[in-house]
Amino acid sequence: ATKLTEEKYELKEGQTLDVKCDYTLEKFASSQKAWQIIRDGEMPKTLACTERPSKNSHPVQVGRIILEDYHDHGLLRVRMVNLQVEDSGLYQCVIYQPPKEPHMLFDRIRLVVTKGFSGTPGSNENSTQNVYKIPPTTTKALCPLYTSPRTVTQAPPKSTADVSTPDSEINLTNVTDIIRVPVFN
């Protein structure tokens, strides 16, 4: 049975959440991946997704969310810049594999964003206030609209289990435009 576990990230407004979803299996490398928010009692909502097929080391930006898939490591990097208090919530990464239901990546992220000066980065957080320059070319997001009823949650149980590979998610308002972004160093 699948155990739904969470990993908590506590950050300040203006900071950047920078997490990785471990999709483990090579067969998922080219699969389209999505970042979803889970609100109690509702279907998970897709906020951003990679292209289909998912390209290696090819950043996609949707608003303040940046997704980058690293096939060589089996990891999807998810960044959310300029965090706001309203971004607080529960998130998950999934792999789209139609016609089957999305495959969930382990674990969920419980993001808590608080007001206050971001200060110096600690060993367990990234408080860099990066400003990403966005090129003018944009395309429409092509995220699948379906969500499996089996992924609907009542308030998911809060877990303190420290599990090996965090996954990642975040919140934003306008998810219509996907923007290709150069690699940031």
Epitope: T2, K3, Y9, L17, D18, V19, K20, D22, T24, L25, E26, S57, E68, Y70, D72, H73, G74, L75, R77, R79, H103, M104, L105, F106, P121, G122, S123, N124, E125, N126, A161, D162, V163, S164, T165, P166, N185
Partner: antibody
Framework: EVQLVESGGALVKPGGSLRLSCAAS????????IHWVRQAPGKGLEWIGR????????KYDPKVKGRFTISADTSKNTAYLQMNSLKTEDTAVYYC??????????WGQGTLVTVSS | EIVLTQSPATLSLSPGERATLSCRAS??????????LNWYQQKPGQAPRLLIY???YRGRGIPARFSGSGSGTDFTLTISSLEPEDFAVYYC?????????FGQGTKVEIK
Amino acid sequence: EVQLVESGGALVKPGGSLRLSCAASGFNIDNTYIHWVRQAPGKGLEWIGRIDPAGGRTKYDPKVKGRFTISADTSKNTAYLQMNSLKTEDTAVYYCTGHYGGTMDYWGQGTLVTVSS
Amino acid sequence: EIVLTQSPATLSLSPGERATLSCRASESVDNYGISFLNWYQQKPGQAPRLLIYAAEYRGRGIPARFSGSGSGTDFTLTISSLEPEDFAVYYCQQSRHVPYTFGQGTKVEIK
């Protein structure tokens, strides 16, 4: 070509400190996790911990938590293992590794740490 | 923490023979439809090499004679026909829970 090179191994007295380095080439450590694993002479493998260099988030084996600290400098593409209050039982070859398939891959050649008076 | 127990401790075989190594976990290492159980090979004086990840998937450049199976708590590494370079120590390792843990190893030696 992906390569990890550990350095900093030395002979150190019990109670002493040491910092090991893990220099990566052929990939950006921002894009993966870096793990540290050790192997005492003639013994098995023991996972020490890992870091997500991009976010700085770390995880440790409880046996070393508080004494060992993993960090990374992404501008140098290098991860570090700071070891304090060293004990004789910390004598081992220390490896850094990259990440693949949900676990550790891309291993360095290892660096020997000897803790002895 | 999850304890991994490997058996046998030593396996004495000849080249061309089939090797079957076992790894048992103290609790399930399955989640999200994946078994987070991996196998490594280590030769003297060398770093370990990832052979099998997620119980059944071969690592990069690993020959087809290596295969993995199992789920939950019981796992097997099979080498269909031993080559001279396969004589080494094999470790299972779980990446389901922190701390990641390794088995004590199985030495495959020439008979």
